[in-house]
């Protein structure tokens, strides 16, 4: 799998898509997880509803929410409020059994805020009682790895 | 008018099968998932498990309970859902319903179920 | 499973009273609740979706409200005809009902 760069803005939303083949997954939940070092595992943030058949309906855990059009082969996960410490690699993932399929690899990374040199009042934060669709979505900015880019980083 | 309507329950005997019909007239039957619900004697409502609509092509989803005993079909040229209920046991004595979950757009639905039949009685006695 | 916990389990109030239920769930469910009506002998009846939608058709002194674990259904003025058991169904995890409440005319 190549990897998959979405671009962020600091205190914004961002929008992963992963497509992938709606009759070859067929069934399956999916969920959005974070890669944890190079050969780690890959920890689980948040999965598609336990009914398949209401994969479509938006589940969250904290700041991050996945919604699945398994009609249409589209995983979208929205990271909320994006922070610097949301930046690293993830997965989307389709499950079956105790097994998973990586259905694609991503890179998140977060840029400055070009804004936060202006006082406060001139932010828009979302509120905590604010929905997720209310939030701002910005277009991400997406690009794959280029062959020989390294993902990871070589460890010292 | 649209209406749903429940037949095939009765008195059957632990361990034994039986099939419960829920017939849909007044609306496109393919467009929405149904679903089949249950009622004890003097007690809540529990979801038994439902079918997706037409572009989900018969997938079924059930609850713990009834899981690998219980299947959920449906048969779009008469408009017809389905419950197959196998190895029977005393505690599935009930009222089921069928119900039909609302609409958005083309094959998304809600969980919401805004039309219901009138129920059929199932005894499951010895 | 979610559990969902239905208060009161019955009440009895006069005509035109408000009449308030309250539903909550064992965990978040953001707004995922439904409210329906059972009459006696009868099929339940969709009143409220997504907490605090109401069902086309449904007389405007229902109403439902709340997220997260906290939900409430309301009676603005009861009727006779509003007599029957209330029932609360989330759809966050699977789908499971609250106990029902069952709403009697002093």
């Known amino acids: 799998h190549n990897t998959t760069v979405f671009q962020g803005v600091e205190g914004q939303s961002l929008q992963v898509s992963c497509p992938y083949d709606s009759m070859k997954h067929w069934g399956r939940r999916k969920a959005w997880c974070r890669q944890l070092g190079e050969k780690g595992p890959c920890q689980r943030v948040v999965s598609t509803h336990n009914l398949w058949l209401l994969s479509f309906l938006r589940r969250r855990n904290g700041s991050t929410a996945i919604t699945d059009d398994t009609l249409g082969g589209t995983l979208t996960i929205t990271l909320r409020n994006l922070q610097p410490h949301d930046a690293g690699f993830y997965q989307c993932q389709s499950l079956h059994g105790s097994e998973a399929d990586t259905l694609r690899k991503v890179l998140v990374e977060v840029l400055a805020d070009p804004l936060d040199h202006r006082d406060a009042g001139d932010l828009w934060v979302p509120g905590e009682s604010e929905s997720f669709e209310d939030a701002h979505v910005e277009h991400s900015i997406s690009r794959s790895l280029l062959e020989g880019e390294i993902p990871f980083p070589p460890t010292s | 008018e649209v209406q749903l309507v429940e037949s095939g329950g009765g008195l059957v005997q632990p361990g034994r099968s039986l099939r419960l019909s829920c017939t849909a007239s007044?609306?496109?039957?393919?467009?929405?998932?149904m679903s089949w619900f249950r009622q004890a004697p003097g007690k809540g409502l529990e979801w038994v498990g439902f079918i997706g609509s037409k572009a989900y092509g018969g997938t079924t989803e059930y609850t713990a309970s009834v899981k690998g005993r219980f299947t959920i079909s449906r048969d779009g040229s008469k408009s017809i859902a389905y419950l197959q209920m196998n190895s029977l046991k005393t505690e599935d004595t009930a009222v089921y319903y069928c119900?039909?979950?609302?609409?958005?757009?083309?094959?998304?639905?809600?969980?919401?179920?805004?039309?219901w039949g009138q129920g059929t009685m199932v005894t499951v006695s010895s | 499973d979610i559990q969902m916990t239905q208060s009161p389990s019955s009440l009895s109030a006069s005509v035109g009273d408000r009449v308030t239920i309250t539903c909550q769930a064992s965990?978040?469910?953001?707004?995922?609740l439904n409210w329906y009506q059972q009459k006696p002998g009868k099929a339940p009846k969709l009143l409220i979706y997504?907490?605090?939608n109401l069902e086309t058709g449904v007389p405007s002194r229902f109403s439902g409200s709340g997220s997260g674990t906290d939900f409430t259904f309301t009676i603005s003025s009861l009727q006779p005809e509003d007599i029957a058991t209330y029932y609360c169904?989330?759809?966050?995890?699977?789908?499971?009902f609250g106990g029902g409440t069952k709403v009697e005319i002093k």
């Open positions: 169904q989330q759809y966050d995890s699977y789908l499971t």
């Open positions: 007044g609306f496109t039957f393919g467009d929405y998932a």
């Open positions: 119900a039909r979950g609302k609409r958005y757009s083309y094959g998304y639905w809600h969980p919401a179920f805004d039309v």
């Open positions: 965990q978040d469910i953001t707004n995922y």
């Open positions: 997504d907490a605090s």
